[in-house]
């Protein structure tokens, strides 16, 4: 109770009271002091006596404490994708008996929902409300409407406002859990078919067969097939077990294989499902190509006279394919060139770079030449090899080795002598000239004898026909 000070300039003081008079109430000196936060209702009882008649006992005085902020309470809620829910107590509550009764109590939308709208039941549905009255809430006219997007959560923030007494609530956030609904059908986006070799097994690539679905994962997109007309569908790791279904995830992982059998042109009908929606009546085409096989005939041995040029011929190197491929399309690539000479093209600069590619047609024309380069050391027989790769897409490549035999033994039109050197001799008339090793050298006959033993051997020239215009 407010009591005046003893002196005039002394400030009034607050004293707890056990009793007070009607006059003290009338002059506003009896105060209730709220001391427990969050406790917003209280009561005390009185015995009232006037001195006349019997006193009134146990008169209950109830108090309602008005909090500094309007006590707006929120409860999180769930809504199906594309669904709605009425925002009414207990989802949205203003506690205590006082504030809800205020005519001017309204709710402001501080942050609207991102994936939905707050709407009045009978109002325009175009956009979200920015404010609404508490009465609308009580009459269950306000609802949250989800926009149907593939989102799992949403949120919005409200604040209560009592305009006639200038009080507000703290901002209150609502979290909305969106329960997903499989409402989007699967869409086949790619169906290019498969090209493969006859009798082969190949993965059905995801680039050839793909579907999408806004609300289903790749493991939920299931292809269910009917009997393939030219093979069977199996999974990697179980080639003996034919399957009638597979998922987009399995396609993405390269796990779905088609094993070709029978006709070259065929495939399978299939339906596509996400577990809820089915898209029937599709066809995946499988086209098989006959295997083109390359084969190499010919001796694959080239005999070359020392120091001379020898063309490759069809007797040496003759490629063909099971598809009767044009010789111009049968391509040789020189993987490893000759060590004892070089390969070149007759129509190209013979001093140019080493030949890398040539065709079977060029072999037939005699345009591919092997030139043997004479070494400094004498030899009787030498062996060279060319490693070639024959290719003619789409056939598989074939490796080939061309053996080159360089020998003094062979009859050589370009070189009548079998000797390392037999250059002949220039002699001035009536004079003599020395026959040196530069003019006549048969040491190649000893080339097969190991070096340490060569001193034990010598070459003997036996004259079978003497000169008729001079003498040795």
């Amino acid at each position: 109770m407010v009591s005046r000070g003893a002196l005039a300039d002394e400030p009034p003081s607050l004293d707890p009271v056990q009793s007070f008079s009607q006059e003290a109430v009338d002059t506003g000196r009896v105060l209730y002091l709220h001391s427990r936060p969050e406790a917003w209702s209280d009561a005390f009882s009185l015995d009232v006596a006037s001195g006349l008649g019997a006193p009134l006992e146990g008169v209950l005085v109830e108090l309602e404490v008005l909090p500094a902020a309007i006590p707006l309470e929120a409860q999180n809620f769930s809504v199906p994708e594309g669904g709605s829910l009425t925002l009414a107590p207990p989802l949205l509550r203003v506690s205590g008996p006082y504030f809800p009764t205020l005519l001017g109590l309204s709710l402001q939308v501080l942050e609207p929902p991102q994936h939905g709208a707050l709407q009045k039941e009978d109002g325009p549905q175009a956009r979200t409300l920015s404010a609404f009255s508490w009465r609308m809430v009580e009459e269950q006219l306000i609802r949250y409407v989800h926009d149907g997007s593939e989102t799992l959560t949403d949120s919005f923030v409200l604040m209560a406002n009592a305009s006639e007494m200038d009080r507000q609530s703290h901002p209150v956030a609502f979290t909305v859990t969106v329960l997903p609904v499989n409402d989007q059908p699967p869409i086949l986006t790619t169906n290019t078919g498969l090209q493969m070799w006859e009798g082969a097994t190949a993965p059905i690539p995801a680039e050839a067969l793909r579907s999408t679905d806004g609300d289903s994962g790749s493991e939920d997109l299931v292809y269910t097939i009917e009997q393939p007309s030219n093979g069977r569908v199996v999974l990697r790791g179980a080639p003996g077990t034919e399957v009638r279904s597979f998922t987009q995830a399995q396609l993405d992982g390269g796990l779905v294989l088609f094993s070709h059998r029978g006709t070259l042109d065929g495939g399978f009908r299939f339906r596509l499902s996400d577990g809820e929606h089915t898209s029937p009546g599709h066809f995946f085409r499988v086209t098989a190509q006959k295997q083109v096989l390359l084969s190499l005939k010919g001796s694959q041995t080239l005999t070359v006279c020392p120091g001379s040029v020898q063309p490759l011929s069809s007797q040496t190197l003759r490629a063909s394919s099971s598809a009767g491929t044009d010789p111009q399309l049968l391509l040789y690539r020189v993987v490893r060139g000759p060590q004892l000479g070089r390969l070149f093209h007759a129509q190209q600069d013979s001093t140019g770079e080493a030949l890398v590619n040539f065709t079977q047609a060029e072999v037939y024309a005699g345009n591919i030449l092997y030139e043997h380069e004479m070494p400094p050391e004498p030899f009787w027989e030498a062996h060279d090899t060319l490693e070639l790769q024959l290719s003619s897409p789409p056939a598989r490549d074939v490796a080939a080795t061309l053996a080159v035999a360089v020998s003094f033994e062979a009859a050589c039109p370009q070189r009548p002598s079998h000797l390392w050197k037999n250059k002949g001799l220039w002699v001035p008339e009536g004079q003599r000239a020395r026959i040196t090793v530069a003019a006549l050298d048969a040491s190649n006959l000893l080339a097969s004898v190991p070096s340490p033993q060569r001193s034990e051997h010598d070459v003997l020239f036996q004259v079978t026909q003497f000169p008729s215009r001079g003498q040795l």
């Epitope: 009917e226 009997q227 093979g231 077990t241 399957v243 009638r244 499902s273």
Partner: antibody, heavy 112, light 107 residues
Framework: QIQLVQSGPELKKPGETVKISCKAS????????MHWVKKTPGKGLKWLGW????????TYADDFKGRFAISLETSARTVYLQINNLRNEDTATYFC??????WGQGTTLTVS | DIKLSQSPSILSVTPGETVSLSCRAS??????LHWYQQKSHRSPRLLIK???DSISGIPSRFTGSGSGTDYTLNINSVKPEDEGIYYC?????????FGGGTKLEIK
């Protein structure tokens, strides 16, 4: 309409061979696989095997590998089930069916 | 091989009741599950294909559901003519397999 008509009942001795037929009509024969099922009295249905009517390739359940052979004659739109070296336990009714929906009337085989 | 387990093996009901027959696969079969009814000395009759697809000519009281490994055949308001053996068949991978069957008796 779609029909699968099977050959009539068979009475055979152990060791003999039987060939049951199933003739299809009313649909494109090579579009759908043909299956064979065994039904023994007092027991359930057992899937025996199937044939790819487009490629002619048969597939068998493990219990039916060896003595059982499924074949087809595309021009006659007919699938066959041949059982060699018959045993008493082969006594059953054999059904053909195509693409889940369509079933033959069944062929009763008695081996005695 | 994929095993199919059907339960119960025998079911005895009175007309008008609703029954559920279960079929469980040993691995996922991607709804490649078909339900058949077989009466004695008759060919099996397809009731439901691909787990839940209805078949023309089959009464609407027969419905199917399920995915992955677990499938159910429901018969709403059973009629006396529904008596028979019910089989499920998986057509996902070879060898295809039938369940052991559920015998439905009408009291």
């Amino acid at each position: 309409q779609i029909q699968l008509v099977q050959s009539g009942p068979e009475l055979k001795k152990p060791g003999e061979t039987v060939k049951i037929s199933c003739k299809a009509s009313g649909y494109t024969f090579t579009d759908y696989s043909m299956h064979w099922v065994k039904k023994t009295p007092g027991k359930g249905l057992k899937w025996l095997g199937w044939i790819n009517t487009a490629t002619g390739e048969p597939t068998y359940a493990d219990d039916f590998k060896g003595r059982f052979a499924i074949s087809l004659e595309t021009s006659a739109r007919t699938v066959y089930l041949q059982i060699n070296n018959l045993r008493n336990e082969d006594t059953a009714t054999y059904f053909c069916f195509s693409y889940y929906d369509y079933w033959g009337q069944g062929t009763t085989l008695t081996v005695s | 091989d994929i095993k199919l387990s059907q339960s119960p093996s025998i079911l005895s009901v009175t007309p008008g009741e609703t029954v559920s027959l279960s079929c469980r696969a040993s691995q996922t079969i991607y709804k490649n599950l078909h339900w058949y009814q077989q009466k004695s000395h008759r060919s099996p009759r397809l009731l439901i294909k691909y787990g839940s697809d209805s078949i023309s000519g089959i009464p609407s009281r027969f419905t199917g559901s399920g995915s992955g490994t677990d499938y159910t055949l429901n018969i709403n308001s059973v009629k006396p003519e529904d008596e028979g053996i019910y089989y499920c068949l998986q057509g996902y991978s070879t060898p295809w397999t039938f369940g052991g069957g559920t015998k439905l008796e009408i009291k």
